[in-house]
């Protein structure tokens, strides 16, 4: 039950995280004009990964896409790549994790297969989250560097009389969305990996069928492995896999493919 809950929660958290990563990637407010001490501005600039926008106090907003590819800074290209990789990995991870969910029965899929799929999706979520966090952090670092550079030459004197006010940019909402979303995806991935440990069989290098002697119960394991007695809770805890064949205890306690948890 705890495993199912952990897996389910991991899936939901990752789903929210990946939705957030997609939202952050699409958002225009990765960097926003620093307003200094003036909260009201006649012209407000903000930029995303794909286009830059200007909002006038008149309400008019104009956005222009970055139609060049080679002319863009390498860092921006790197951030784009990281975010896209994060989304792709996350999307694949979601797809894999749907089939790995314990509460969903697909044919006669073994629990070992579900465990492997859960681990795979968990790793994908972790990498996806790390990609998003890395991408956002690289962009944030780029902003901080540019911010202090533009602060250093805030006013460039032209002929002593004329001044050019340089537009400084600070963190936009998309950065915070990206950090939170990346963190959630990462947490979701860790939860999936934890759930995988609960799903995985203790010993997977043998097939076993339970044979019962008339006198006392002994689980016979072919292949020279040590037999364990059938007394107490030992056989209950030890999950023995052989396709559809199960121990008597398992037949009673495991849900059929028609049950929904």
């Amino acid at each position: 039950m705890a495993v199912t809950a952990c897996q389910g929660l991991g899936f939901v958290v990752s789903l929210i995280g990946i939705a957030g990563i997609i939202a952050a990637t699409c958002m225009d407010q990765w960097s926003t004009q620093d307003l200094y001490n003036n909260p009201v501005t006649a012209v407000f600039n903000y930029q995303g990964l794909w286009r830059s926008c200007v909002r006038e106090s008149s309400g008019f907003t104009e956005c222009r896409g970055y139609f060049t590819l080679l002319g863009l800074p390498a860092m921006l290209q790197a951030v784009r790549a990281l975010m896209i990789v994060g989304i792709v990995l996350g999307a694949i991870g979601l797809l894999v994790s749907i089939f790995a969910l314990k509460c969903i029965r697909i044919g006669s899929m073994e629990d070992s297969a579900k465990a492997n799929m859960t681990l795979t999706s968990g790793i994908m979520f972790i990498v996806s989250g790390l990609c998003a966090i890395a991408g956002v952090s690289v962009f944030a670092n780029m902003l901080v560097t540019n911010f202090w550079m533009s602060t250093a030459n805030m006013y460039t004197g032209m002929g002593g009389m004329v001044q050019t006010v340089q537009t400084r940019y600070t963190f936009g909402a998309a950065l915070f969305v990206g950090w939170v979303a990346g963190g959630l995806t990462l947490i979701g991935g860790v939860m999936m990996c934890i759930a995988c440990r609960g799903l995985a069989p203790e010993e997977t290098n043998y097939k076993a069928v339970s044979y019962h002697a008339s006198g006392h119960s002994v689980a016979y394991k072919p292949g020279g492995f040590k037999a364990s007695t059938g007394f107490g809770s030992n056989t209950k805890n030890k999950k023995i896999y052989d396709g559809g064949a199960r121990t008597e205890d398992e037949v009673q306690s495991y849900p059929s493919k028609h049950d929904y948890v």
């Epitope: 006649a42 012209v43 903000y46 926008c53 200007v54 008149s58 050019t164």
Partner: antibody
């Protein structure tokens, strides 16, 4: 047709207050910032402040801060500008103007002459 | 605050001739975000409120005759009337539309020679 109709001329004594109204029609009042600009005799136009009819948020020119108050009556599509502690140099024509694309004023009121004299 | 200085203060031009009014800003009015210059031109006739002619330094307002044109970038701007008509006699103002507080030039009085 967009129209901004202002209240009539006012004569005030120094230290008094004046409240000028600006009734808007022909457009969605709550969609555009309303600005106030004054023009003293022989002087350049001077921006006083602005108010957004939807949110009620305001922004004032530092020169007039503390003396000017911009208010609204949304139901009547009317903006008000109140200037207190009047001085003789406040004698001017006061305009309300609607802000449009390019942060430019496309429609102006006809102007309200305020004379401050003892 | 941004200071706008217009030149000349007054200008007399013959009918049908070209009239040129300049406006110099103490700060650049060019917005890097959209490469637009936030300078506006108005025409004011006696006893009337100003009338919008040009915004974004060179975009003509609808209904404004095409003899009016604006040019310039950064700190130096020009309003040109290609062929002066009698109804163009007025005072012309430039306005900073880039930063608050919005400021205006002192005006240029255009007359017929």
């Amino acid at each position: 047709e967009v129209q901004l109709v202002q209240s009539g001329a006012e004569v005030k004594k120094p230290g008094a207050s004046v409240k000028v109204s600006c009734k808007a029609s022909g457009y969605t009042f709550t969609s555009y910032w309303m600005h106030w600009v004054r023009q003293a005799p022989g002087q350049r136009l001077e921006w006083m402040g602005m108010i957004h009819p939807n949110s009620g948020s305001t922004n004032y020119n530092e020169k007039f801060k503390g003396r000017v108050t911009l208010t609204l009556d949304k139901s009547a599509s009317t903006a008000y500008m109140e200037l207190s502690s009047l001085r003789s140099e406040d004698t001017a024509v006061y305009y309300c103007a609607r802000l449009k694309t390019g942060n430019s004023f496309d429609y102006w009121g006809q102007g309200t002459t305020v004379t401050v004299s003892s | 605050d941004i200071v706008l200085t217009q030149s000349p203060d007054s200008l007399a031009v013959s009918l049908g001739e070209r009239a040129t009014i300049n406006c110099k800003s103490s700060q650049s009015l060019l917005n890097s975000g959209n490469q637009k210059n936030y300078l506006t031109w108005y025409q004011q006739k006696p006893g009337q409120p100003p009338k919008l002619l040009i915004y974004w330094a060179s975009t003509r307002e609808s209904g404004v005759p095409d003899r009016f044109s604006g040019s310039g970038s950064g700190t130096d701007f020009t309003l040109t009337i290609s062929s002066l008509q009698a109804e163009d006699v007025a005072v012309y103002y430039c306005q900073n539309a880039y930063t608050y507080p919005f400021t205006f030039g002192q005006g240029t009085k255009l007359e017929i020679k």
